[in-house]
């Protein structure tokens, strides 16, 4: 990778300047696509900010950009005007250029912000040169709010600054009035005034009457050293405009503005709702607007005025519907900074906000909300609720339109029916069960983002706190013991201080769950079970008769049990015990305790019993070590001798 270009950027004070290929140009020996030449901002600017023309200019600082985006002029540096005057300021950006597999290259971009530069959007080289409005035949003070050269002083090191001043030399005097300093008129023999006199409010313009034509004066400003000595330093020659207004003139009153809302890539007329003024003594055609700063999401155009952007228009253009905003592909909001004048009063700043609406929004639901059973609550995340349109909508607001039946939503521990995407992203929105009679719930929300809404249903399920056996296959035709090695809700018991209960909802398809008689004295056969407890599992009182799939050749099969698990003070949960089965294999060590094996296997072993043994298992079968796991079928027989 190599980096060409000047790596310096000259920026006018308070302006936006795009980075260009003259400033920053990366290339690689492999001729890499500029899209793949990636800059990472290691240290951002201190005097302004870097942002992307197509993205939110008010959002977070830019972190990455590509050489292609530099070529397109989409990477912008904006200088932010400081409160204190300056003549020249320097900023730096530290960047890292990367394009694997090449080694990264570090780069520093130097930014010079200077009043010396010729700036079309800031024609004056002074800190302020705003001009003056004066009523006809009257006087007005020219203060540093209108004319201020303190940025020239800022070029002097601060210890010596107090000994310096700025000398203004009037090179062309006002034609319709006169300038006075401390009530003394300026004239060709005495054409000077100082920045210090301006700052002290000693400069006055007195209008001579006889009309409201424009007036003004030209001047040259330069630094003056101690005792009035001329010193080398910045200087400028400029004009100061003086507008004379009719004494009876009432200034226009801007009216409250409603933001313009439109979808991206579309066009919308601007009406009086966006731009209007009350001015009884001016016609709409006399009220002029000028664009001081335009947003990046589109431009203003006049019907019949060509396709390009306009920077000047009148209230008459607005009132007649001739002015429109044309949105580009950007999806971010923006603001026009305008100045408005009736030609006789000082220009007033106005703004026009443009909000780019999504044509539609969608609530993305990636997964149901899973609530851990022992907690009974869970935080919502972007997995459950996230609004997207033409971009992600971080400002989305949600309102419950149908609440959950078995719980409620809380923010900060308080029940709530309204919350934001930000609160979801922060993990602050919690669903908590309040009624522990259902293993699932749902609620419906209405999402609102930038004036568009959409609804969605969030499903809630409870995740059982249950350890489920996940071993190898079980033998068809056998009865195996259901104990905590197969199903264990012991942790749920500890967490709730209760004995968890199971209810069989479904399955197995081939087989059944039975209660095993404790001893020979108990009445014979196994009883079918639909409900049991953790205690039953721990006591070894339960068996699972593993059936053979009917109507097909013997072979491996799959089966499952669906259970509902209940405990005190927590919602119930549905869990599955999925298991594989296979024809019984005497030589195979099964990892569960078998209470009986298929009849055919027993007959082969020379044990002429026709009934399935359902009595109490022998010591081996009931020990923690599974019986058949020890040594195949003979060991099983030994273990079950006494039954």
């Amino acid at each position: 990778l190599s980096l060409k270009g000047s790596q310096t950027l000259t920026v006018c004070p308070g302006s936006v300047q795009p980075l260009s290929s003259q400033t920053l140009r990366a290339s690689s020996s492999a001729g890499t696509d500029p899209q793949l030449l990636l800059y990472r901002v290691v240290r951002g600017p201190q005097l302004g900010r870097l942002f992307h023309a197509q993205q939110d200019s008010t959002g977070e600082a830019l972190v990455n950009f590509t050489q292609a985006e530099v070529y397109a002029g989409n990477i912008l540096y904006e200088h932010e005007m400081p409160p204190e005057p300056f003549w020249e300021a320097h900023d730096t950006l530290e960047l890292q250029l990367s394009s694997p597999p090449a080694r990264d290259v570090a780069a520093t971009l130097a930014v010079a912000v200077s009043f010396e530069a010729a700036c079309p959007q800031h024609p004056s080289h002074l800190w302020k040169n705003k001009g003056l409005w004066v009523p006809e035949g009257q006087r007005a003070r020219i203060t540093v709010a209108a004319l201020d050269a303190s940025n020239l002083l800022a070029s002097v090191p601060s210890p010596q600054r107090s000994e310096h001043d700025v000398l203004f030399q009037v090179t062309q005097f006002p034609s319709r009035g006169q300038l006075l300093v401390s009530e003394e008129p300026l004239h060709a023999g005495q054409p000077h005034f100082l920045q210090s006199q301006l700052a002290a409010g000693q400069l006055v313009y007195a209008h001579g009457g006889g009309g409201t034509q424009q007036d003004g004066f030209h001047f040259r400003a330069h630094l003056q050293g101690p005792a009035g000595a001329s010193v080398a330093g910045p200087q400028t020659s400029e004009a100061f405009a003086i507008t004379v207004r009719d004494v009876n003139e009432r200034p226009p009153q801007p009216q409250a503005s409603v933001p313009l809302r439109l979808t991206r890539g579309s066009r919308a007329p601007i009406s009086r709702a966006q731009l209007s003024v009350v001015d009884p003594d001016s016609a709409p055609g006399e009220i002029e607007y000028e664009v001081q700063r335009a947003p990046h999401n589109g431009f203003l155009s006049l019907v019949g005025g060509g396709l390009g952007p306009v920077t000047r228009f009148t209230q008459a253009d607005v009132d007649s519907g001739r002015l429109a905003f044309v949105a580009n592909g950007s999806s971010v909001a923006g603001i026009f900074q305008l100045s408005m004048s009736d030609g006789a009063s000082p220009p007033l700043p106005m703004s026009l906000a443009v909000d780019i609406l999504p044509s539609a929004i969608e609530v993305q639901l990636r997964a149901p909300l899973e609530v851990p059973q022992a907690l009974g609550r869970s935080s919502l995340s972007q997995q459950q609720l996230r609004v997207v349109s033409d971009r992600e909508e971080p400002e989305a607001a949600y309102r419950l339109i149908q609440g959950p039946q078995y719980g409620h939503l809380l923010v900060g521990g308080r029940p709530t029916s309204a919350f934001s995407q930000f609160q979801i992203d922060q993990g602050e929105v919690v669903f908590a069960f309040t009624n522990f009679s259902s293993s699932h719930d749902h609620f419906r929300v209405l999402a609102l983002a930038r004036g568009v809404n959409a609804s969605a249903v969030v499903n809630v399920t409870v995740r059982a706190l249950l350890h489920v056996w996940a071993g190898g296959p079980w033998p068809q035709g056998a009865t195996l013991r259901l104990d905590p090695t197969v199903l264990d809700a012991g942790e749920l018991a500890n967490r709730t201080g209760s004995v968890p209960r199971f209810r069989l909802l479904e399955g197995p398809r081939h087989g059944r769950v039975v209660r095993v008689p404790r001893a020979r004295t108990e009445p014979g056969g196994s009883q079918l079970v639909e409900q049991f407890t953790q205690q039953d599992l721990e006591d070894g009182r339960l068996g699972l008769e593993v059936g053979r799939p009917e109507g097909r050749a013997p072979g491996p099969a799959g089966d499952s049990l669906t259970l509902e698990l209940w405990a005190q003070g927590v919602p119930p949960a549905v869990a599955s015990l999925d298991f594989a089965t296979e024809p019984y294999n005497a030589a195979r060590p099964y990892s569960v305790a078998l209470l009986s094996v298929p009849e055919a296997a027993r007959t082969e072993a020379g044990k002429p019993e026709s009934s399935t043994p359902t009595g109490e298992p022998g010591p081996m079968a009931s020990s923690p070590e599974p019986a058949v796991a020890k040594g195949g079928f003979l060991s099983f027989l030994e273990a079950n001798m006494f039954s």
Epitope: L410, R414, P415, A432
Partner: antibody, heavy 112, light 107 residues
């Protein structure tokens, strides 16, 4: 800040239906989550009667469920309590509340 | 139903004392606990919600703590206006239930 105000008769005859209304100001009953009725027998603790939510769904205390109905009128921003077949044991101060804020309470005496 | 048991049922204390009231739930309530203050003839006022969050406008001398089944309301330095009855209430499981109340009296 939400304010709640109970209204209704202070005396109800045994076996009749107690009816109270709560008027909410400073907030909408379609935006707050729970709108509760709670009562307090003289010199005793608090007993939750039931609630109606922002979307109109209800939940009642099982001990009173067969006799309680809570409804709402969104146009008036009010919610109401009806307790049927009252006895002297239903004599209490009845409060409406959203848990953050409570009405000042109204004493209902059941007596012939 | 979840039973809420407050202790003590009453206590006597002086201005400036540190006072602690406990509330025990018959089973875990996940922190969903409110504390209210009630003065004679008045409605209860929320002091603390979600175990330890101070309601707006409540003086910082009130604090709450606890988890699982055991919860505490502490008044760090009792003021004359704090003499009242205090109630705890759970909103973890329906029906919502209250403790029987603790009366704080002047010694």
């Amino acid at each position: 800040q939400v304010q709640l105000q109970e209204s209704g008769p202070g005396l109800v005859k045994p076996s009749q239906t107690l009816s109270l209304t709560c008027t909410v100001s400073g907030g909408s009953i379609t935006s707050g989550y729970y709108w509760n009725w709670i009562r307090q027998h003289p010199g005793k603790g608090l007993e939750w009667i039931g609630y109606i939510t922002y979307d109109g769904s209800n939940n009642y205390n099982p001990s009173l469920k067969s006799r309680v109905t809570i409804s709402r009128d969104t146009s008036k921003n009010q919610f109401s309590l009806k307790l049927s077949s009252v006895t002297a044991a239903d004599t209490a101060v009845y409060y409406c509340a959203d848990f953050d804020y409570w009405g000042q309470g109204t004493l209902v005496t059941v007596s012939s | 139903d979840i039973q809420m048991t407050q202790s003590p049922s009453s206590l006597s204390a002086s201005v400036g004392d540190r006072v602690t009231i406990t509330c025990r739930a018959s089973y875990g309530i996940r922190g969903y606990l409110n504390w209210y203050q009630q003065k004679p003839g008045k409605a209860p006022k929320l002091l603390i919600y979600y175990t330890s969050s101070l309601h707006s406008g409540v003086p910082s001398r009130f604090s709450g703590s606890g988890s699982g089944t055991d919860f505490t309301l502490t008044i760090s330095s009792l003021q004359p206006e704090d003499f009242a009855t205090y109630h705890c209430q759970q909103y973890s499981a329906l029906p919502w239930t209250f403790g029987q109340g603790t009366k704080v009296e002047i010694k």
